[in-house]
């Protein structure tokens, strides 16, 4: 189920690549965030907290990512036209409960000016 389009700027372009921003509520302590391209899982990141508040970050499908207290950024490089697609942030909240899954996303448009290695 798609809950809606992102209510923030999801795509940030720089240096022929794109940063895809996936937000989560900053109250959330344990979660899994997946980046989907269409229906395919491109990246995932799971944050858990153990005893003594030990934080563990795991990735089954690794992408260059960056975690903050309310977002996960996934980075895609060497953009070309094949990257144009719908991208979704699939968030599974584990703690604090209730368990909740939300899917938000948007369409990544690729313009010539954003491509990595344009022929001059």
């Amino acid at each position: 189920e798609i809950n809606g389009s992102a209510n923030y700027e999801m795509f940030i372009f720089h240096n022929g690549g794109v940063q895809i921003l996936c937000k989560y509520p900053d109250i959330v302590q344990q979660f899994k965030m997946q980046l989907l391209k269409g229906g395919q899982i491109l990246c995932d990141l799971t944050k858990t907290k153990g005893s003594g508040n030990t934080v563990s970050i795991k990735s089954l499908k690794f992408c260059h990512s960056q975690l903050s207290n309310n977002s996960v950024s996934f980075f895609l490089y060497n953009l070309d036209h094949s990257h144009a697609n719908y991208y979704f942030c699939n968030l599974s909240i584990f703690d604090p409960p209730p368990f909740k899954v939300t899917l938000t996303g948007g369409y990544l448009h690729i313009y010539e000016s954003q491509l990595c290695c344009q022929l001059k």
């Epitope: 923030y8 509520p25 959330v28 409960p97 938000t104």
Partner: antibody, heavy 121, light 106 residues
Framework: QVQLVQSGAEVKKPGSSVKVSCKAS????????MHWVRQAPGQGLEWMGL????????NYNQKFQGRVTITADKSTSTAYMELSSLRSEDTAVYYC??????????????WGQGTTVTVSS | EIVLTQSPATLSLSPGERATLSCSAS?????MHWYQQKPGQAPRLLIY???KLASGIPARFSGSGSGTDFTLTISSLEPEDFAVYYC?????????FGQGTKLEIK
């Protein structure tokens, strides 16, 4: 139906502590986190903190850090909020509120009826 | 701390009129929630995620806005709508409420 029932009114002396209870029914207690919010007379609402029932993880408003302790007893489906070193400014109605999520944010979807705490010498 | 400023502090209207309540945040928030409180009662959730109607809330209530400016609208006031309304943000710690708008009968 989903209900949060809080303990009765308390009158406390400055410097003492108060422990307010919030008994949940109509849902699985460990499936939700619980927040505490207070409202001083004629004032607005103030978030105090929360507890994740299943992990016991707590998160407090820094304003109350060191004075507030939120706990939960899974066996009785009851959450507790204890406030120590009471002063007159702590006179307020204290509410528990159940945590829930929308697509983008979190909110309190069910509230207790409130517990009046009066701090007076 | 994100400060939420509600305006007006008091709004005097008659049943059947349209009410527009504002909530302004001192810095940008991702979403806003709205609560209604009647004397001697606990607050009740009206709107979550800026514009979504909570369960059991009549369709005359609606929410809108983004960034720092949010609005709660009641399209046609019913006698039971006269109460205090609070906005709430859970985007930035510590999580804060507005000071409230009292909606009273004119």
């Amino acid at each position: 139906q989903v209900q949060l029932v809080q303990s009765g009114a308390e009158v406390k002396k400055p410097g003492s502590s108060v422990k307010v209870s919030c008994k949940a029914s109509g849902y699985t207690f460990t499936d939700y986190a619980m927040h505490w919010v207070r409202q001083a007379p004629g004032q607005g609402l103030e978030w105090m903190g929360l507890i994740s029932i299943y992990s016991d993880h707590t998160n407090y408003n820094q304003k109350f850090q060191g004075r507030v302790t939120i706990t939960a007893d899974k066996s009785t489906s009851t959450a507790y909020m204890e406030l120590s070193s009471l002063r007159s400014e702590d006179t307020a109605v204290y509410y528990c509120g159940r945590n829930n999520y929308g697509n983008y944010g979190w909110y309190f979807d069910v509230w207790g009826q409130g517990t009046t705490v009066t701090v007076s010498s | 701390e994100i400060v939420l400023t509600q305006s007006p502090a008091t709004l005097s209207l008659s049943p059947g009129e349209r009410a527009t309540l504002s909530c302004s945040a001192s810095s940008s928030v991702s979403y806003m929630h709205w609560y209604q409180q009647k004397p001697g009662q606990a607050p009740r959730l009206l709107i979550y995620d800026t514009s979504k109607l909570a369960s059991g809330i009549p369709a005359r209530f609606s929410g809108s806005g983004s960034g720092t400016d949010f609005t709660l609208t009641i399209s046609s006031l019913e006698p039971e709508d006269f109460a205090v309304y609070y906005c709430f943000q859970g985007s930035g710690y510590p999580y804060t409420f507005g000071q409230g708008t009292k909606l009273e009968i004119k």
